[in-house]
């Protein structure tokens, strides 16, 4: 088999015609990164290398996965002869898979005369451009539409040699030299009708599998050269083994001890040191909506519950900035903890225009609603007028305290005439220091939170000359009916420490949608949970008693086993293979017949879609 | 450039008065709470008086409640501190400083919470 199965893998480069250095430290650089290597993971790029240099440490290289440039070298041949795919999951000059350009010198006789591609059969994608390489030739014998799998692109190539020697009689006029041995190997063109990719010879039974890349040996998916997709331990395959299969009993998917990673065109037992796992790939970094985590010993991406966590720097002493102002605010952005304070100072709000700092936009201030901890204090001396309360601070649940400001606090609110609530509805926990809130004239519903249940400590508070108490409740400033006894943070259901009867997403309620409504709902506790959507809803009962679809009073659409599904497996993997099924007329989902392949409308094998195995052959698994 | 200059200083015999001024510029001095700070020789530093940029809360130490006055002219980023009934420990160099952090009820502005600083002003109090 030429398709191994542990392979030398290193890392290409994304320069274009950018070089570092003299032509000396181009090649040191290029030795560094290609000696010893099988698979370019991204491009090679071989640019201003002197004829001089042994660029034989290349022959290793089969494969490349995005581009190859040669621009501007004097080197008179490329040892790439063992090179058998490029995949083209990046281009040059946004078409190009081969770019080869200007490889000669106008002033000595020093030129690339010859590409010696000769393994090169397959271009999985992008085209081909060799022009104005004033020696090279054997570049227009080569019949690239065998080697492009992009049957709409033509190949650019002119400008190049003209006093070339014509291709050895026993090439059929294909051919990447003169000798024999550079006869091209026809792996497309040359095929019987029948073979929907590669073949290894003209025959109809010489068709490759359709896995294979670039040609084959023989019929399997192990006689490949290399891989239209994915080589797992020799053999191509269209998906590396998944991190889930099917359970035949439990009926659900579960994790696959025999899962592998994709790590470029390979599939691989664990990921290189450096890399994480996503889903089933090996990643340098996770995306921007997951975070990394170790799960038994194993870095992996997961989606994050909402905002991805991020760490910003805040304000005050040891910080950059004194307050939040028009200069700093966007450093905020999609920030869930700061590290540090954050002070609102009058300089801040209305800008400075001695140090030319303009008057913040107070729309701007909504920058904090992700923020759900502060390490240090929380200090409010001056806010927008217009602003009756701080609820770009809704989601904020800690304030640590660990630095304090002035007399050792932690939550300072001063002097804000306009503010009529706190707004602070998911603070949670003050760890630290004490609580000032002074001198806002028009501020209720403090009056009613319970400071003690926020504080690790005995609250130390410090709270007066807001709006009185007996004020506050003339004017029917007081807590929603909904709240429980520990208060509220400002006005309506959502500003309610806890809740009297249920809550629903941070809201109280008098009730959850247990039995009437659009969405019905199931209890945690006192908390409202919707009801899995392959529930079907029970007018006048119980729709649910849990979150997953095994707890469906009825299926909206179909039963496997115990849980609801959209509808019946149809080729999940399971453990020795795809699983397909049918639902029966009481919408249970069935097994097909064993040699079914496609799916089935019933149990028989007249009931398969598509053809069926004949019954002498291996069948994948059903039950 | 940010300045802070002090003057009304001198010799002034016991029970004296004396009233100290404080000019200041490049910065927005409406939005400033400004503190009376002096520091006798061999002495720390120490907080006299300070007046909040908006609403004119004052704070006093203990040491010149009832014989001293802080007030402030925003028309004129002018603040001063008018000193009655002198003490001979009233000796020191007075310092005006300019703070971004308001003064309320119960706080103290402390030296590190002011940005900007006055160079000094000689205050002498002896027979």
């Known amino acids: 088999s030429e398709v191994g199965n542990s392979q030398a893998v290193c890392a290409g480069t994304l320069n274009g015609l950018s070089v570092t250095g003299d032509a000396q430290h181009q090649y040191r650089t290029l030795h560094k990164m290609y000696n010893n290597c099988e698979i370019v993971m991204g491009n090679l790029e071989i640019v201003l290398i002197d004829h001089t240099q042994d660029l034989s440490f290349l022959q290793t290289i089969r494969e490349v996965t995005g581009y190859i440039l040669i621009a501007m070298n004097v080197f008179s041949t490329l040892p790439l002869r063992n090179l058998r795919v490029i995949r083209g999951t990046q281009f040059y000059e946004e078409k190009y898979a081969l770019f080869v350009l200007l490889n000669y010198n106008p002033n000595a006789t020093h030129a690339l005369r010859q590409l010696g591609l000769n393994r090169l059969t397959e271009i999985l994608a992008g085209g081909v451009y060799i022009e104005k390489n004033e020696q090279l030739c054997h570049v227009d014998t080569v019949e690239w539409r065998d080697i492009m799998r992009d049957p709409r692109l033509e190949p650019v190539v002119g400008d190049n040699g003209r006093a070339c020697a014509p291709c050895h009689e026993s090439c059929g006029g294909h051919c990447w030299g003169p000798g024999p041995e550079d006869c091209q190997q026809l792996t497309k063109t040359i095929c019987a009708p029948q073979c929907n990719g590669r073949c290894f010879g003209r025959a109809p039974n010489e068709c490759c599998h359709e896995e294979c890349a670039g040609g084959c040996t023989g019929p399997l998916q192990t006689h490949c050269f290399a891989c239209r997709h994915f080589n797992d331990s020799g053999a191509c395959v269209p998906l590396c083994p998944q991190p889930l299969i099917y359970n035949k009993l439990t009926f659900q998917l579960e994790p696959n001890p025999d899962t592998k990673y994709q790590y470029g065109s390979v599939c691989v037992r664990s990921c290189p040191h450096n890399f994480v796992v996503d889903q089933s790939s090996c990643v340098r970094a996770c995306p921007s909506n997951k975070m990394e985590v170790e799960k038994n010993g194993l870095k992996m991406c997961e989606p994050c519950a909402g905002l991805c966590p991020k760490a910003c720097e805040g304000t005050g002493a040891g910080s950059h900035y004194q307050t939040v102002d028009s200069s700093n605010i966007d450093s905020f952005v999609n920030c869930t903890k700061i590290l540090g304070n954050l002070d609102f100072l009058i300089t801040g709000l209305e800008g400075d225009p001695w140090r030319n700092i303009s008057a913040l936009d107070p729309e701007k201030l909504n920058v904090f609603r992700t923020v759900r901890e502060i390490t240090g204090y929380l200090n409010i001396q001056s806010w927008p007028k217009h602003m009756h309360n701080f609820s770009v601070f809704s989601n904020l649940e800690t304030i640590g305290g660990r630095s304090l400001y002035n007399r050792g606090f932690s939550l300072l609110i001063m002097k804000n005439d306009n503010v009529t609530s706190l707004g602070l509805r998911s603070l949670r926990e003050v760890s630290a220091g004490r609580v000032y809130i002074t001198e806002n004239r028009r501020l209720c519903y403090l009056h009613t939170v319970q400071w003690a249940a926020l504080s690790r400590r005995r609250a130390d508070l410090d709270i007066r000359n807001n709006k009185p108490r007996g004020k506050c409740q003339q004017e029917g400033k007081v807590c929603d009916p909904l709240c429980s006894a520990d208060g509220c943070w400002g006005p309506g259901p959502a500003q309610c420490l806890s809740c009297r009867h249920y809550s629903r997403r941070g809201v109280c309620v008098e009730s959850c949608s247990f039995t009437q409504g659009e969405t019905r709902e199931f209890a945690e506790g006192t908390e409202c949970f919707e009801c899995h959507p392959e529930c079907e809803r029970v007018e006048g009962g119980i729709t649910c008693n849990g979150s997953g679809a095994d707890t469906c009073t009825r299926c909206a659409h179909y039963r496997d086993g115990p849980h609801c599904v959209e509808r019946c497996p149809e080729g999940i993997l399971g453990e020795r293979g795809p699983i397909y099924k049918y639902p029966d007329s009481s919408r249970e989902c069935r097994p097909c017949h064993e040699n079914c392949t496609r799916g089935c409308t019933g149990p028989l094998l007249q009931d398969c879609l598509g053809d069926a195995l004949p019954s002498a052959r291996r069948a994948p698994t059903v039950i | 450039e940010v300045q802070l200059v002090e003057s009304g200083g001198g010799l002034v015999q016991p029970g004296g008065s004396l009233r100290l001024s404080c000019a200041a510029s490049g910065f927005t001095f409406d939005y400033y709470t400004i503190g009376w700070f002096r520091q006798a020789p061999g002495k720390e530093r120490e907080g006299v008086s300070c007046?909040?940029?908006?609403?004119?809360?004052?704070y006093y130490a203990d040491s010149v409640k009832g014989r001293f006055t802080i007030s402030r002219d925003n028309a004129k980023n002018t603040a001063y501190l008018q000193m009655n009934s002198l003490k001979p420990e009233d000796t020191a160099v007075y310092y005006c400083?300019?703070?971004?952090?308001?003064?309320?009820?119960?706080?103290?502005?402390?030296?590190?919470?002011?940005?900007?600083w006055g160079q000094g002003t000689q205050v002498t109090v002896s027979s």
């Open positions: 007046i909040s940029s908006r609403d004119g809360d004052s």
């Open positions: 400083a300019a703070s971004a952090s308001d003064y309320g009820l119960g706080l103290e502005l402390f030296h590190d919470e002011y940005n900007y």
